[in-house]
Interface confidence: medium
Amino acid sequence: MNGRVDYLVTEEEINLTRGPSGLGFNIVGGTDQQYVSNDSGIYVSRIKENGAAALDGRLQEGDKILSVNGQDLKNLLHQDAVDLFRNAGYAVSLRVQHRLQVQNGPIGHRGEGDPSGIPIFMVLVPVFALTMVAAWAFMRYRQQL
């Protein structure tokens, strides 16, 4: 099956205030530790329970962080990116890219949010049509009596 996975990409500016235990998330990525093939970007890999990011609620695991306090995260070594976060101060502004998976393709394609891979309307439309045909046949049958 050649179902295509499309992504709805949105960007958001998230302002976090460093909490008692910091910003409260983990990252992967960097030029020396590519998380996504052909992409050395920095991605959120874990949101820590009760941390600043978790309490804010906007940052999600899988988000790509584009910049910290206006500083671009492109082409950085992993540890350099880590250090940038650690030295970012009390108020931290993150430019973040969210990727929402959208299903687009034939019936056999399995989307992340739909375990059966079949959109609900693909089931409802035939059921509705069958119901209408059965009702019409029943009415015709009654008229003949």
Partner: nanobody, 128 residues
């Protein structure tokens, strides 16, 4: 998923040395931060030492600082705890733990149990 198996525990006399090993099986061991914890009889499990995924950062509980050394060999998927100048109060079951999910932007030093995703069954160390 990561499976952790500790070995190297035993009964030793005070002042002796012991090296614990923790062999990991499963995917990408080299990206996991590793830690050692211990639980003495009748006490809560406590943090002993941790090492970052690169091996570049280590951190120790005050009670073992200068006596214990944590290290790792990513080629062998193994983390070690070298314990010198052992004391009777070091008697405990020692647990190896692994934490996935990249690097914390806050600290390399994960000292809380809840930070860790995978745990071994433990190995007994008794110092007489």
């Amino acid at each position: 998923h990561v499976q952790l198996v500790e070995s190297g525990g035993g009964l030793v006399q005070a002042g002796a040395s012991l090296t614990l090993s923790c062999a990991a099986s499963g995917r990408s061991f080299s990206t996991y931060h590793m830690g050692w914890f211990r639980q003495a009889p009748g006490k809560e499990r406590e943090f002993v030492a941790t090492i970052s995924w690169t091996g570049g950062s280590t951190y120790y509980a005050d009670s073992v600082k200068g006596r214990f050394t944590i290290s790792r060999d990513n080629a062998k998927n193994t983390v070690y705890l070298q314990m010198n100048s052992l004391k009777p109060e070091d008697t405990a079951v020692y647990y190896c733990a692994a934490r996935g999910g990249g690097t914390s932007v806050d600290s390399d030093y994960d000292v809380e149990e809840f930070e860790y995703d995978y745990w071994g069954q433990g190995t007994q160390v008794t110092v007489s």
